[in-house]
């Protein structure tokens, strides 16, 4: 509550608003007949700073000199203390401490565009905590002066609202800013400049790009600029890049040829302008122009691989696979792939365009020497064809890589290692490591992956299209001229025990032994590469440990004979599967009683 000072007065000298570090005099005096029982000697006047007693005096008035007040407001209260009564508030005072303005620093002025107005900015320095009036003065030739004021605690910008013209671009102008508040004043150092120093051109506009004859090598960038612009700088980058290419040009007159753009690439272009070689400042960058460069015919060659599959005595199936060209090699949208199949001795050739796929399957006779060529085509032309002779990739046993192993290498990676073939290792021209998901049916629709490795390498890390808990059939081919040798292994990047055991679907009796047939475990339940199956059996109603037979896992196998069962005894049989991580739960149980005679 604001006290009305009915009992007395508080006066403050020199003011309620003082400079940081200065002294303030506070006087508290009682009005007539407002003391203790009218006995002045009993009056005890006490001065509080906030809630802390800082001075007292017996009598009608109290005078106190106060120093060291902090920035901001400090509250003083004068109270009267009489014997046997509570202190009575007489009057209060708030003293506000601020600072005089510091010298404004780094005064700089700018005119945005030839038609813009002069505006200046500066650094105010330390906060004064007080209303401070800033006056900006500009003086020019012929004793012309302009002045603008801003009355705000936080003023650091003023626009004169006048336009400097290029009639006499070398004429000097001087700007100065003065800050004044109730505690003092300070002026900046003068800033002297010419028209050319302070005019920052507007950014270029209406940016366009033209490709003569739809060719990336004949590209011109066009733009519009203010009339006095002398210099431009251009920057451009592919839209997916963070790094800019930079070009400086003089007297470009709104056009520049660009020679190093890549085809079929979206670029971002920006331009900035300047009026003078070494005076003034660059404009802001223009708005971005985004444009796609035209296509060029593909470069590079496709990476092609193939698989052969025997159909019957006279026919074989050839499946060709190839990898997409990289963006920089495709140099455009690949419209189709051209596959040419040729019988080398008879000269018979067949050409087909493939769209939307990177594979092709056909059936050819088992006789004759066959070759294929595959190329990629965009709107401007085709890549050089990749030619390969179709051969039996695993025919040369002496070229087969040795000691092939496949080990998990972190998440979704498999490290394949091998030893060179026994035959002269220097004959190997390259290794190809091929992998595909293992499907018990040998499904040819399963995607094929491959990578090429130099002849001196004996390992490869495969990571493309590798999933956890999936078993891959991995082959390593050693190629030499028109011969090849191969070795294969199963591998997985991560494994655990299978989720289920095989399902026994039939038990048949054959000459005193039995043949157990089962259904493969679904691929998604195998949880990696299977190493073994186990067949368990025990007499029905017996508490004895079951007997077992462990069979190495082979992809195509789904039956196995057992000849150690006694005739006319009922047995319970079941199966499990094992990966390197452990054994599955039981599959289904089947009962069987052998009818034949005991051996």
């Amino acid at each position: 509550k604001i006290d009305a000072c009915k009992r007395g007065d508080v006066t403050v000298k020199p003011s309620h608003v003082i400079l940081l570090g200065s002294t303030v005099n506070i006087t508290c005096s009682l009005k007539p007949r407002q003391g203790c029982f009218h006995y002045s000697r009993r009056n005890k006047l006490i001065l509080y700073k906030f809630d802390r007693r800082i001075n007292f005096h017996h009598g009608h008035s109290l005078n106190s000199q106060v120093t060291g007040l902090p920035l901001g407001t400090t509250l003083f209260v004068c109270k009267l203390a009489c014997i046997n009564s509570d202190e009575i508030q007489i009057c209060g005072a708030e003293i506000f401490v601020g600072v005089a303005p510091e010298q404004p620093q780094n005064l700089s002025c700018i005119q945005k565009g030839e038609q813009g107005t002069v505006a200046c900015t500066w650094e105010r320095g330390r906060d004064t905590h007080l209303y401070t009036e800033y006056t900006l003065q500009l003086s020019g030739p012929k004793n012309l002066t302009w002045q603008k004021q801003c009355k705000d605690i936080y003023c650091d910008y003023l626009d004169f609202g006048i336009n400097l013209t290029p009639e006499s671009p070398e004429s000097n102008f001087t700007a100065k800013v003065t800050a004044v508040n109730s505690l003092g004043s300070s002026s900046s150092l003068p800033s002297t400049f010419t028209f050319l120093d302070i005019v920052r051109p507007l950014p270029p506009w209406d940016i366009r790009i033209k490709f003569q004859k739809a060719s990336v090598s004949r590209c011109t960038l066009y733009w519009r600029d203010e009339g006095l612009v002398l210099l431009n700088r251009l920057r451009y980058r592919p839209s997916n890049s963070r790094l800019w290419n930079m070009v400086n040009v003089t007297k470009a007159k709104g056009r520049h040829d660009l020679l190093d753009l890549k085809p079929f690439t979206e670029y971002e272009f920006q331009i900035s302008s300047k009026l003078h070689l070494y005076k003034g400042s660059w404009s802001d960058w223009s708005e971005s122009l985004r444009a796609q460069t035209p296509e060029e015919e593909p470069t590079g060659m496709l990476d092609v691989w193939y698989m052969k599959r025997h159909i019957d005595y006279s026919r074989q199936q050839i499946s060709l696979f190839w990898k997409n060209l990289s963006v920089s090699e495709a140099r455009g949208k690949i419209l189709h792939y051209q596959v040419t199949l040729q019988e080398l001795t008879g000269g018979k050739a067949m050409t087909q365009n493939i769209t939307g796929h990177t594979s092709w399957t056909t059936v050819i006779p088992r006789t004759g020497n066959w070759a294929v060529a595959v190329s990629a085509a965009n709107s401007k032309g085709s890549s050089l064809p990749t030619r390969i002779n179709i051969m039996n990739l695993c025919e040369a046993g002496l070229l087969a890589p040795r000691q092939v192993s496949a080990n998990s290498e972190g998440m979704d990676n498999i490290l394949v290692t091998w030893q060179p073939p026994r035959k002269d290792p220097s004959a190997v021209q390259e290794y190809v490591v091929e992998w595909r998901e293992l499907h018990p049916g040998g499904d040819t629709q399963v995607p094929l992956n491959w990578l090429r490795s130099r002849p001196y390498n004996v390992s490869a890390l495969i990571s493309e299209n590798i999933k956890s808990y999936i078993c891959y059939e991995i082959r390593v081919y050693a190629l030499s001229g028109d011969q090849g040798g191969c070795s294969s292994i199963l591998g997985n990047s991560k494994h655990k025990a299978p989720l289920s055991g095989p399902h026994i679907n039939a038990i048949t009796e054959e000459k005193g032994s039995i043949l157990i047939s089962w259904n493969s475990i679904p691929v998604q339940e195998q949880m990696g590469c299977l190493l073994h199956y186990r067949i368990y059996w025990k007499e029905r109603d017996s508490n004895s440990q079951p007997q077992l037979c462990e069979i190495p896992y082979r992809v195509s196998q789904n039956s196995h004979p057992i000849n150690s069962l006694q005739p006319r005894v009922t047995y319970v049989l079941w199966m499990t599967a094992l990966t390197a991580a452990g054994e599955s739960s039981h599959g289904n149980e089947r009962e069987f009683c052998l009818q034949g005679k005991a051996n």
Epitope: I2, D3, A4, C5, D9, V10, T11, V12, H16, V17, I26, G72, T73, L75, F76, C91, G92, A93, E94, F96, G98, D127, T128, H129, L130, Y131, I153, S182
Partner: nanobody, 119 residues
């Protein structure tokens, strides 16, 4: 910001009295200090008297004992009672209000009222 309107100025003979009134309108909350300043022709503007919202006062040495400043916080009015006027008191008298603005003070000024003391 606050708007200030001064009244009560005029022509008076030496030894006479005048009462100046300043009324604050607009966002007049948190006015910390209300002051009277004066500016004689060709001179700097100087503090005459000020009164804080708690009632404490400050007077220029040249007017102490002759001038009294008072303030009605409820009505946002500040009065300057000027007695025993002298010719050297002739000036334009300006009202000023200092308001809290965050941890700073923001000032507002009136347009002034002319006081002329003839001898």
């Amino acid at each position: 910001q606050v708007q200030l309107q001064e009244s009560g100025g005029g022509l008076v003979q030496a030894g006479g009295s005048l009462r100046l009134t300043c009324t604050a309108s607009g966002s007049a909350a948190l006015i910390f200090l209300m002051s009277w300043y004066r500016q004689a022709p060709g001179k700097q503007r100087e503090l005459v008297a000020e009164v804080s919202r708690r009632g404490s006062t400050t007077y220029a040495d040249s007017v102490e004992g002759r001038f009294t400043i008072s303030r009605d916080n409820a009505k946002n009015i500040v009065d300057l009672q000027m007695n025993s006027l002298k010719p050297e008191d002739t000036a334009v008298y300006y009202c000023k209000a200092d308001q809290y603005y965050g941890d700073s003070l923001r000032s507002s000024w009136g347009r002034g009222t002319q006081v002329t003391v003839s001898s």
